[in-house]
């Protein structure tokens, strides 16, 4: 768990407290809120980031149609329970003993219940669809250049292996980025698509999680790409379980 040795900060997570108290005086960083040690050479898990955020002071070219089982994070922020590896616990509860099951990106996938609710396993989100609308430009971006730029971004900024960016679709002004990562595909050390998507979402909102790095300046052959709307859909390996009442609402 090392960070930049010269000034002991965490380049990949500004929501940390760092000090040279690791083995041999090495810089060690702990996430705010949870106090868990984080690996500053890679992205911090979304669960630990959400927890830190809640602890901080308040201030074919055709587009993809999300499947009927796609989830959108409508519940917003909450203070999650994370396991010792920093992953979301399958069951989340609030202070009023209302509980629900979440997927690996922390999005609710069942109706809310009480403390008797059982969530047998953490269901993996294996497909994420990031739906963006860019601000008007003089003309459409070149699709291949846009595609390459977004793939480069996920490789370079978020350290997501190129094999996990399944596709980039573009129909001006809508851009869709598809991330896919099955349990069997994800090797030790691989960045999780859920974590990459969360960092990207925060970057797009101008809330970069990186320390001492400029905000996201997306350009396609020098032309600024400014995003005005973002929607993220999450597809789980096992479809969510909501009551018919919610589905017909």
């Amino acid at each position: 768990h090392t960070a930049a040795q010269d000034n002991c900060t965490c380049p990949t997570n500004k929501m940390t407290v760092c000090s040279p108290d690791g083995p041999g005086g090495r810089c060690q960083c702990r996430a705010l809120g949870s106090g868990m040690a984080v690996d500053c050479s890679t992205l911090t898990s979304k669960c630990l980031l959400l927890k830190a955020r809640m602890s901080a002071p308040k201030n074919a070219r055709t587009l993809v149609r999300p499947s009927e089982h796609a989830l959108v994070d409508n519940d917003g922020l909450y203070d999650p329970d994370c396991d010792p590896e920093g992953r979301f616990k399958a069951r989340q509860c609030n202070q009023t003993s209302v509980c629900w099951c979440v997927n690996s990106v922390g999005v609710r996938r069942t109706d809310k219940g009480d403390l008797s609710l059982r969530c047998d396993e953490l269901v993996r989100t294996h497909h994420i669809l990031i739906d963006l609308r860019h601000r008007p430009t003089a003309g459409a971006f070149n699709h291949s250049d846009l595609d390459a730029e977004l793939r480069r971004l996920f490789r370079e900024r978020y350290r997501l292996h190129p094999k996990f960016v399944a596709a980039v679709h573009y129909e001006q002004p809508t851009i869709q980025i598809e991330l896919r990562q099955n349990t069997s595909q994800k090797a030790a050390g691989d960045v999780d698509i859920g974590d990459a998507a969360y960092y990207f979402e925060r970057d797009i909102k101008g809330e970069s999680l990186f320390q001492g790095r400029g905000g996201l300046d997306l350009r396609v052959r020098g032309e600024p790409l400014q995003v005005e709307r973002t929607l993220i859909y999450y597809l789980d390996e096992i479809p969510p379980k909501f009551s018919m009442k919610r589905l017909t609402a």
Partner: antibody, heavy 117, light 106 residues
């Protein structure tokens, strides 16, 4: 063991085209990116562009756009870089290199292309 | 395009010397990469993410820096270290390299 084996040296006349191959082994070809870099005699390294092998997405630098074509044959795990309208200043060693979460982690041995009348 | 300028362009040193090569970027980059190239051979990745040694690279090599200023240091030169070194960025297209620093035996 990851290996990138490039085709042999080529001598071409000005105005002609050259196609350099890069055969990959030791990894899942379509999971990666192949970048192309050239080095003129006694000079530094110059990036030409890259191809995402899984999707076929390509990015060429402005300097080479219109003259370079990058392709890949997934059945033989081979990437190709074709440069047309050759001129003497294109004389260089052309390298292919694998990209992942690094820009270039493994390199081919290089292919010398000589353009001379 | 982001220009990378290496300093010095060439350097004569002796075995056992401590050597520092700098790389200055025309605008801020996230990370710097360093490659070693020997005559007639392909470049070899030495350091990634500014300061992380690639597997198999001796610990006498180190990298540091941020923003626009980066350095590669060899703490005690060995005979096999005499080569040309290049810095490289990929924070934005097109990827660019420094012009190289040739390290020669004094």
């Amino acid at each position: 063991e990851v290996q990138l084996v490039q085709s042999g040296p080529e001598v071409k006349k000005p105005g002609a085209s050259v196609k350099v191959s890069c055969k990959a082994s030791g990894f899942t070809f379509t999971d990666y990116v192949i970048g192309w870099v050239r080095q003129a005699p006694g000079q530094g390294l110059e990036w030409i562009g890259e191809i995402y092998l899984g999707s076929g997405t390509i990015y060429y630098t402005e300097k080479f756009k219109g003259r370079v074509t990058m392709t890949a044959d997934t059945s033989t795990s081979t990437a190709y870089m074709e440069l047309s309208s050759l001129r003497s200043e294109d004389t260089a060693v052309y390298y292919c290199a694998r990209g992942s979460i690094f820009p270039f982690d493994y390199w081919g041995q290089g292919t010398l292309v000589t353009v001379s009348s | 395009d982001i220009q990378l300028t290496q300093s010095p362009s060439s350097l004569s040193a002796s075995v056992g010397d401590r050597v520092t090569i700098t790389c200055s970027a025309s605008s801020s980059v996230s990370y710097m990469y360093w490659y070693q190239q020997k005559p007639g051979k392909a470049p070899k990745l030495l350091i990634y993410d500014t300061s992380t040694l690639q597997s198999g690279v001796p610990s006498r090599f180190s990298g540091s820096g941020s923003g626009t200023d980066f350095t590669l240091t060899i703490s005690s030169l060995q005979p096999e270290d005499f080569a040309t070194y290049y810095c490289q960025q990929w924070s934005s297209y097109p990827y660019t390299f420094g012009q190289g620093t040739k390290l020669e035996i004094k």
